[in-house]
């Protein structure tokens, strides 16, 4: 059922792939120590090696089910007819501390399995209590979770999980915090972290909201932990813009949701509209996001410490069509520092009694903020009043890159040697490689420097993940996982092409004459051995720049700029024709042109000149590493006085013998010569 690795698309060398033609792929995670890849799919969970060979497959479905059966048929007989039902993997998380994989599906009201990482052996499948049912919604990319490990040696691990509920608010909370027990069969598994008769670690969509807006739901696009907070990026029906009339047009809004990790009562719940705008165009439909560190250059430009978090996001244009958003999309940047500051300001103003809680979907009454003398700092986690809280002003990101033609669907990022590299997946199955640097030429904050095909014509899904060593990017479509190298420096065959590519991974390894990463270039830290800037490409001049084909062993003086120490020696190489020894003196290279005998085959049948590449060849590496054009000219091919003396070379016309020569002495003294045209 799993395809063998085969070639990727396009003109690049073949990429490693894993194909699952029968079952749609939905989620992908990579183990940060082993580099092994776990893939969630419809009815299957796969374990792959880092180079995408299939190691294990675990069957999760189809199952005999009916989504109307609550609790599921495995727990209680059900009056509704059962049928073979696909089990769509909706959540796939690595629990490193317990050496297990958490895989939650759509079947049986959304139960989860715990699988052993080594062999995908099923350790447990809690399914008999209402807390075990997360949501029966089938849409794969709508649920998100964050696994919080317990303090070492004590305390409880927990799962923050957000999910759409498809109107079933009596069955499923939209957001909750659940216990993760060491024993997969523990009765408390997935129990709410806190629960009493008034409050618990959950948030439900009120039935009043669903009565008024039957289509209301919250779709969880991305979740992450930053410092002591858990964040979610969500898409939800905009109840301000959408009319309650079911036939009316639906508008959506993106929200960033925040909770304190250690807030079991959810008093810290805050949500804010989020988006970005460029040239008057609003991008409001969040497609994906990725938490990253900024890389030194970007950190300095943004005035951040290098260990602060930034959030790269992709938004589609407008607020309509959640399922098929417009193609026009934007890559945007948020700093967590700015997000935290905006949230803090909102909380502070509410605790000064200003405005309302402003959360219409959750609070049916417009509740006012209550004045309180509390000190609100960056770490504030709420009280039993002035919560839950909604932001009224959109948190705006910095637009980095707009794609008008091929919608952006996924994003990942990392820091390579201080530079910030972003990878964006597209609808057509491409990976765009983008350098984020506010000091890019032309004031563009992001430069798309390369685009490669992962799978032609198939949208890249959200789980775009880097390998632990940052050498590869795993890109997933519904049918295939592709391992894309983060760089293909070797494709650039000259220093100018290499550094002109603007790929931050690539530099020119001078004496090896190859485009590579710095760490793949021998002795790269020695001066001028590794060029990282176009200005550092080797320049070469030669004097004289041309010689006559009849001249033998002419002394040549070459001057080279941006070269490393050449004391190991260099040769002069005239293409592949001939090579001569050189001497280094006063920073110049002295060598000789070929003998007349060696020149003859180079110039035969070539007219009045033959341009060849004169190379410097390193004795240390045996590679040609710099070149300059060198000309062998042949006066004797000219048959007329005019063509002889009007050419580019110092040719002389012997008046009486009617021959063209470079050597004045060839013309008999008495017959005279012409070296400029005479009327």
């Amino acid at each position: 059922e799993a395809g063998l690795p085969r070639a990727g698309g396009g003109s690049q060398p073949p990429f490693r792939t894993f194909s699952a033609s029968d079952w749609g792929l939905t989620h992908l995670v990579v183990h940060e120590q082993t580099g092994e890849v776990y893939v969630g799919a419809v009815n299957r969970i796969y374990k792959l090696s880092g180079n995408l060979t299939l190691l294990r497959a675990h069957v999760t479905g189809p199952v005999e089910d009916n989504e109307k059966c609550y609790p599921p048929p495995s727990v209680q007989s059900c009056p509704h007819g059962l049928g073979s039902t696909d089990n769509v993997n909706k959540l796939l998380l690595l629990d490193y501390a317990a050496n297990r994989l958490l895989a939650c599906g759509s079947a049986s009201q959304g139960i989860c399995q715990f699988l052993r990482l080594d062999d995908l052996f099923k350790l447990g499948e809690p399914h008999h209590r209402k807390e075990h049912y997360l949501s029966s919604v089938q849409e794969a990319g709508s649920m998100a979770g964050v696994l919080i490990a317990g303090p070492p040696g004590q305390g409880q691990a927990k799962l923050f999980v957000g999910t759409p509920i498809d109107g079933k608010s009596e069955y499923f909370p939209t957001l909750s915090s659940r216990r993760l027990m060491a024993n997969e069969e523990d009765a408390d598994m997935f129990g709410f972290v806190y629960q009493d008769e008034f409050v618990s670690s959950q948030l439900k969509i009120p039935s009043d909201t669903l009565s008024k807006f039957p289509a209301f739901d919250i779709y969880y696009v991305y979740s992450f932990r930053s410092e002591q907070f858990v964040y979610y990026l969500t898409l939800q029906l905009d109840t301000q813009l959408t009319s309650p009339d079911a036939a009316g047009e639906h508008f959506f809004t993106s929200k960033i949701v925040r909770l304190c990790v250690d807030d079991p009562k959810f008093y810290s719940y805050v949500e804010f509209p989020i988006g970005c705008e460029q040239a008057g165009v609003e991008y409001r439909l969040v497609q994906d996001a990725y938490l990253s560190r900024p890389g030194r250059a970007l950190a300095h430009q943004l005035g951040l410490a290098e260990d602060e978090d930034v959030l790269f996001t992709v938004f589609a244009q407008g607020q309509k069509n959640r399922v098929k958003p417009p193609k026009e999309s934007a890559l945007c940047l948020f700093t967590l520092r700015a997000i935290k500051e905006k949230i803090k300001e909102r909380i502070q103003s509410c605790y000064r009694g200003e405005g309302k809680l402003s959360l219409p979907w959750l609070l049916n009454k417009e509740l006012g903020c209550i004045n309180s003398p509390l000190q609100i700092d960056d770490d504030f986690c709420g009280q039993d009043f002035n919560q839950p809280l909604g932001g009224t002003v959109t948190i705006e990101g910095t637009p980095l890159f707009v794609d008008k033609d091929d919608g952006l669907t996924a994003v990942a990022a990392y820091d390579y040697r201080g530079r910030t590299v972003v990878f964006a997946g597209t609808r057509s199955g491409r990976i765009r490689k983008i350098l984020v640097d506010l000091s890019n030429p032309g004031g563009r904050p992001a430069l798309a420097y390369e685009s490669v095909v992962a799978q032609e014509g198939s949208p890249i899904l959200r789980d775009l993940v880097l390998s632990p060593n940052h050498q590869y990017l795993y890109a997933m479509t519904e049918k295939q996982v592709t391992r894309v190298p983060v760089e293909s420096c070797v494709q650039y065959t000259s220093c100018e092409l290499c550094l002109g590519s603007r790929d931050p991974h690539c530099g020119w390894c001078v004496l090896h004459s190859i485009c590579s990463r710095r760490d793949a270039c021998e002795r790269a830290d020695e001066p001028q051995r590794f060029a990282a800037d176009l200005l550092q490409c080797v320049q070469l001049t030669v004097q004289p720049r041309n010689v006559s084909v009849t001249m033998s062993q002419v002394p040549l003086v070459l001057q080279a700029w941006n070269v490393p120490d050449l004391s190991a020696g260099v040769n002069c190489s005239f293409e592949d024709f001939t090579e001569s020894e050189s001497v280094l003196e006063d920073g110049r290279i002295h060598c000789r042109s070929p003998s007349a005998r060696e020149v003859a085959p180079i110039t035969r049948g070539q007219g009045d000149q033959r341009v060849v590449k004169l190379y410097l060849k390193s004795k240390e590496t045996g590679k040609k590493f710099a070149s300059v054009d060198f000309v062998f000219y042949n006066c004797s091919v000219h048959q007329s006085c005019l063509s002889c003396v009007n050419g580019s070379f110092p040719c002389h016309w012997c008046k009486y013998r009617h021959v063209c020569t470079h050597n004045v002495a060839d013309c008999a003294f008495l017959e005279g010569r012409v070296n400029v045209s005479e009327d």
């Epitope: 030194r296 250059a297 300095h300 005035g303 290098e306 520092r337 040697r417």
Partner: antibody, heavy 119, light 112 residues
Amino acid sequence: EVQLVQSGAEVKKPGASVKVSCKASGYTFTSYGISWVRQAPGQGLEWMGWISAYNGNTNYAQKLQGRVTMTTDTSTSTAYMELRSLRSDDTAVYYCARGGRGGDAFDIWGQGTMVTVSS
Amino acid sequence: DIVMTQTPLSSPVTLGQPASISCRSSQSLVHSDGNTYLSWLQQRPGQPPRLLIYQISNRFSGVPDRFRGSGAGTDFTLKISRVEAEDVGVYYCMQATHFPWTFGQGTSLEIK
């Protein structure tokens, strides 16, 4: 041409404040940070701190914390450095310098502003 | 704070001859991102400093290639292959790996 032009020389009394300006031209001001460096007469260079022209975030040298404030005005592409509670050992030439692409090397320097603190 | 120590403090050189300035840091300047943020600046008399070299060995644009930087970890060198009259001034090394960023005390290059 990329350049940083600083305000003119100042003479101040101990305890007073001074505010030096640095006007940038020839590049996108918000794309680079600005550092301030001072040089006491006959002495070496001392880094004072840095400001992001993108959003005004700052990082000051510990020994000047509380006395120095760096700001920017993006509408005029100008950076400012204010030093308060001046002492005689603050007498120096004050330079603004643009942080290079990685923020790690100062690639463009202002001409310097001489600040003399004397009673 | 990182202490940057330059030697010699003064270097009299004959025109056309080479010159070498050493700079040693009190701890490694290799940043967690793999780069080493060590630069060299030249300050001619009565002028502001000017960037010559960044990240150990990269010449800044417009800097003649007689200037060459090398080194690793804690030991760095600036070499001038053939000194010209316009090279007279004070040379500073500077580290920007660790906050606060710090400079060497300077090496004065003068013509014999």
